[in-house]
Every structure is written in structure tokens, then in C-alpha cells.
Interface confidence: low
């Protein structure tokens, strides 16, 4: 009869992460009786992956029935497969022995390949709002895929990016690989609503890319312009004024009425407008009683927005061209705002 | 590319003897299992032999057994098949294939094929 | 034995399917050959994998003791019979189905 040989027919076998791999042996012959063994690798430290005689091997499972004996089919499926199994798997025969079972005769090997779908891209942008035209910075980062080829891409708003720089690491071989990128973007005034995607496509997604997205909303700071306008009202002594606070982002806003630098009034913008580009628009109104002063008067709307250095816009009050009411001291009164006005 | 040069065909005598070589190129030919696979007039494909990549392990179709005999050569890159015996059945196209593996599951390369008739 | 159908038809651009049933046969192969005698073209080998240079209109899949060619967007150029190849574990044996001619309208 003939000297029993191993043979593993698969060279190689590619796999999906998660999936399970079918590793394929058949020996030519039941002699010499005695068990087979798989191992990953070969030599002194090479991995038992399964032994027919004794030990427990949860992720392993037989493609035939061992215990028949006539069995020659020694195939092993391994189930959850992860990219930590990638290697060379050798199906071992032993000739039974004692006191122990002696190697016998190997099969050639089948190298496990495994395909890792990358994880989805996280996409992270500055720690610090930015305001526009500056250049802000956002990293796109992806792990765990197999192989090393992968392809990354930005876009902002569907508009592909070109300034970005992206490695995989490691450089070397390894049974898994991460990519970390980071594009430079210019903001605009108009960015409030806008995206920044992060795409990766990999031989694991079947050409139906991952992708990562960061709004600029959590990024961009638009600062507000300020107008003060002066619009008489019914009674002769009073005089509306009225801060229109426009084209801010985000919504935190704190805005300060001064009368000749004195703190009349401080409110925090609550109701607001809301416009197109995602910005918002917001008025208070200062209701000024002119009889109470002798003097013109300045009044100064001052904001401060998303806890930046206050801004302000100043509007000179000509109190002589007002006849002067006896027995007021009150020089202003508190308006709502949000185009309310209480009186 | 891949190419698998059948010869040795011909006109055979019943009861004589064939013997069929091929020739491979274009690839590493002492990593893979080649085969001999026919076809008769008018029928389908029929396994005859097989040889392991090392060249130790040959297997025989059940039509052949006892009749035919596989080596190889990996030095020369061919491979051989003797066959003995021979019965008009045996008529056919004789294609050499390239295996992947082992087993007709894993045949992924053909050569042209070289024609036997046997007969009187 | 292996059980292949005789023939199947399909217009261009249809999906195309072939079964090959065996009694405890694990892995297959699929081979194209034109014409009798001429030399067939493996299309796919070890139920799934495809050479480098067949089309990826062909694939292969396995499931128990059935194996399916599937010809996703067929072409007037497939037009041809499809032998599949089976390595019975059970039997220690390779045999082949007997073919399905393949016929684009």
C-alpha cells in the first residue's frame, strides 16, 4: 500500500471577516492509524488550532464525520473568522504512538487570507470654532480592515476636496491596517448647513463605499453686524430705538443696552429668526423717555456672541429737539424683544 | 499565460499500448496537480488520471484503473500518461489540465487536446 | 453521478443559472466548451473562483450537495455547453456532469 500522503488541495482561501473558513485535507490512506492536527505556522512555536484526539476548540467544527473509520476527510471549518487568524495552516498527520503520538507526515499548507471591512469613518473636526475664511482642519480616521489597499476621499457638500494628506499604517505587513487623513477646509459665511464627508472604499464593501460625515455647524462661528435705528413712537417723549443683531451662528448670544456707558439693560437672545443660510437674526428694542434728560444722550448696543470679546454700535439720542415732560425720572423702560414691544 | 501542449495522439491499436505527453509553460509548474481528462465522440468529459503537484500521489478514474499510469517530470515541466490495453472506448480527445487543488473541482487551466482513435 | 439539466435558453442580458446536484460531491467546477472536442474553458473552479481572465458576468456558489453557475447579463458569446466538474468525497471519485447546452436567443 501506498505511504500515506496529507494534501491540502487550497493554496489559498480568502475570507470575510465574520465568516466562516473552510480549510480542506484528505488523506490517502487510513494507515498509519493515529489522529490529525491543525496548526497555524510552522516549527517550535507554531499554534494548535485543533486536535482530533483530545482538547476543546469552540470555533472549530469538522466537515465530516471523525469518528467513522474509514474517514480520510480531515477538514476543519473556523467559524467568527477575524483578521488575527490570517496565516498558514498545516494539516498534520500522527502515527500513534507511545508514550505520546509522533508527527507523522504534513500537508503543504493553505494560506488564510482575510478580507476586514474597515469600521465606519469617524470624522472629527477642530476643538475651537472658527470663523469664516479661516482654515480649519478635520481627521477622518478608519480601522481594522484587511487588505492594506484603500482608497479615501473628501467632499464638501458633494464637492470633492484636494487639500488633505492620508496614511495607513502600519507601513509594514500586519493582519489588519487603520487609515488616518486630514483635509483643510475654508470656511464661508454661508457653511452653516454645509458637510464634511469622509469617504473610504475598500475590496470588503462591494463598491458601496463607508462613509464618515462632520457638520461645519459644530465648527463654524458667524459673527454678527449690528444696526441701531432711532424710530419715534406715539407719545412725543419717547423714542424707540432698536438693535437689529443679524447673520449670527450659533444661536448664543448675550446683548447689553448702555445709556452714556451705563449698563441699562441685559437680555440673552432667546426667540429668534431663523435665516436660509442657517444663520439667525434677532432685534431688542430700548423704549427711551427723552424728558428724563437734560443732555443728548449715547446709547450703545453692545453683544457678545459664543463667548467672544463684545462688539458694539452706538447711536447718539439729541435730546433738545424734544420737549422736556416734568415729573418722570424714569429714563427708560424694558422692552421684549423678538419684535414685541410692552409698554 | 498559461499553456498546455498535449501530443502523442494518433491511430492505436486495441490491446497496445499510448502514451500521451504534455507539456506546460507559463507558470510554476511543480505547485500544482495536473490532470488528464477525456472526451469521446459525441459524449461528455470523462476524469482519467490525476498526479499531485510533488509528483507522489497519482489517481486513476475508475475506467483506467490498473490500466494507466501517471508521472511527471517537473524538472521538464511535462507530465505523462501511459496507458495500456487499450479498448475502442478508449477513442476520444485527451486534454491535459492544470488543478489548482486537487480533483476535478479545482481544474482551472485546459490544454487543446490531442486526438487517439483505437482501432482495427 | 453528478445531475446537470440538459439545456437552458435565455435572452441577452438575462441571468442564467445551472445547478449541478450530486449525492455528497462538496466542490465543483464549471468548464465552457463550444464545440466537441475543442478545448474547454474552465470558467470557474473550487465552487467559487473565477481565472483571471473569465468575465465577472460568472460565478460560481455551492450550497450542500448543489452547485449554481450563475451568468449575470448573458452574452451571445456564452452560447455553449457547460460541463460541471465534481469531486465526490464519498466516493473518493471525480466525475462529470453530463453537460447543459446553453443557448442565447
Known amino acids: 500500500e501506498e505511504e500515506l500522503q496529507v494534501i491540502q488541495p487550497d493554496k489559498s482561501v480568502l475570507v470575510a471577516a465574520g465568516e466562516t473558513a473552510t480549510l480542506r485535507c484528505t488523506a490517502t490512506s487510513l494507515i498509519p492509524v493515529g489522529p490529525i492536527q491543525w496548526f497555524r505556522g510552522a516549527g517550535p512555536g507554531r499554534e494548535l488550532i485543533y486536535n482530533q484526539k483530545e482538547g476543546h476548540f469552540p470555533r472549530v467544527t469538522t466537515v465530516s464525520d471523525l469518528t467513522k473509520r474509514n474517514n480520510m476527510d480531515f477538514s476543519i471549518r473556523i467559524g467568527n473568522i477575524t483578521p488575527a487568524d490570517a496565516g498558514t495552516y498545516y494539516c498534520v498527520k500522527f502515527r500513534k504512538g507511545s508514550p505520546d503520538d509522533v508527527e507523522f507526515k504534513s500537508g503543504a499548507g493553505t494560506e488564510l487570507s482575510v478580507r476586514a471591512k474597515p469600521s465606519a469613518p469617524v470624522v472629527s473636526g477642530p476643538a475651537a470654532r472658527a470663523t469664516p475664511q479661516h482654515t480649519v482642519s478635520f481627521t477622518c480616521e478608519s480601522h481594522g480592515f484587511s487588505p492594506r489597499d484603500i482608497t479615501l476621499k473628501w467632499f464638501k457638500n458633494g464637492n470633492e476636496l484636494s487639500d488633505f494628506q492620508t496614511n495607513v499604517d502600519p507601513v509594514g505587513e500586519s493582519v489588519s491596517y487603520s487609515i488616518h487623513s486630514t483635509a483643510k477646509v475654508v470656511l464661508t459665511r454661508e457653511d452653516v448647513h454645509s458637510q464634511v464627508i469622509c469617504e473610504v472604499a475598500h475590496v470588503t464593501l462591494q463598491g458601496d463605499p463607508l462613509r464618515g460625515t462632520a457638520n461645519l455647524s459644530e465648527t463654524i462661528r458667524v459673527p454678527p453686524t449690528l444696526e441701531v435705528t432711532q424710530q419715534p413712537v406715539r407719545a412725543e417723549n419717547q423714542v424707540n430705538v432698536t438693535c437689529q443683531v443679524r447673520k449670527f451662528y450659533p444661536q448664543r448670544l448675550q446683548l447689553t443696552w448702555l445709556e452714556n456707558g451705563n449698563v441699562s439693560r441685559t437680555e440673552t437672545a432667546s426667540t429668534v429668526t431663523e435665516n436660509k443660510d442657517g444663520t439667525y437674526n434677532w432685534m431688542s428694542w430700548l423704549l427711551v423717555n427723552v424728558s428724563a434728560h437734560r443732555d443728548d444722550v449715547k446709547l450703545t448696543c453692545q453683544v457678545e456672541h459664543d463667548g467672544q470679546p463684545a462688539v458694539s454700535k452706538s447711536h447718539d439720542l439729541k435730546v433738545s429737539a424734544h420737549p422736556k415732560e416734568q415729573g418722570s425720572n424714569t429714563a427708560a423702560e424694558n422692552t421684549g424683544s423678538n419684535e414685541r414691544n410692552i409698554y | 499565460a498559461v499553456t498546455l501542449d498535449e501530443s502523442g495522439g494518433g491511430l492505436q491499436t486495441p490491446g497496445g499500448g499510448l502514451s500521451l505527453v504534455c507539456k506546460a509553460s507559463?507558470?510554476?509548474?511543480?505547485?500544482?496537480?495536473m490532470a488528464w481528462v477525456r472526451q469521446g465522440p459525441g459524449k461528455g468529459l470523462e476524469y482519467v488520471a490525476e498526479i499531485s503537484d510533488t509528483g507522489s500521489t497519482p489517481y486513476y478514474g475508475s475506467a483506467v484503473q490498473g490500466r494507466a499510469t501517471i508521472s511527471r517530470d517537473n524538472g521538464q515541466s511535462t507530465v505523462r500518461l501511459q496507458l495500456n490495453n487499450l479498448r475502442a472506448e478508449d477513442t476520444g480527445t485527451y486534454f491535459c489540465t492544470r488543478n489548482f487543488g486537487s480533483s476535478v473541482s479545482s481544474i482551472d487551466a485546459w490544454g487543446h487536446g490531442t486526438e487517439v482513435i483505437v482501432s482495427s | 453521478a453528478v445531475t446537470q439539466p440538459a439545456s437552458v435558453s435565455a435572452n441577452p442580458g438575462e441571468t442564467v443559472r445551472i445547478t449541478c446536484s450530486g449525492d455528497s460531491s462538496s466542490y465543483y467546477s464549471w468548464h465552457q466548451q463550444k464545440s466537441p472536442g475543442s478545448a474547454p474553458v474552465s470558467v470557474i473552479?473550487?465552487?467559487?473562483d473565477r481565472p483571471s481572465d473569465i468575465p465577472s458576468r460568472f460565478s460560481g456558489s455551492a450550497s450542500g450537495s448543489t452547485a449554481t453557475l450563475t451568468i449575470t447579463g448573458v452574452q451571445a458569446e456564452d452560447e455553449a455547453v457547460y460541463f460541471c466538474g465534481a469531486y465526490d468525497s464519498s466516493s473518493d471519485s471525480d466525475i462529470f456532469g453530463a453537460g447543459t447546452t446553453l443557448t442565447v436567443l
Open positions: 507559463g507558470f510554476d509548474f511543480s505547485n500544482f496537480n
Open positions: 473552479y473550487s465552487n467559487t
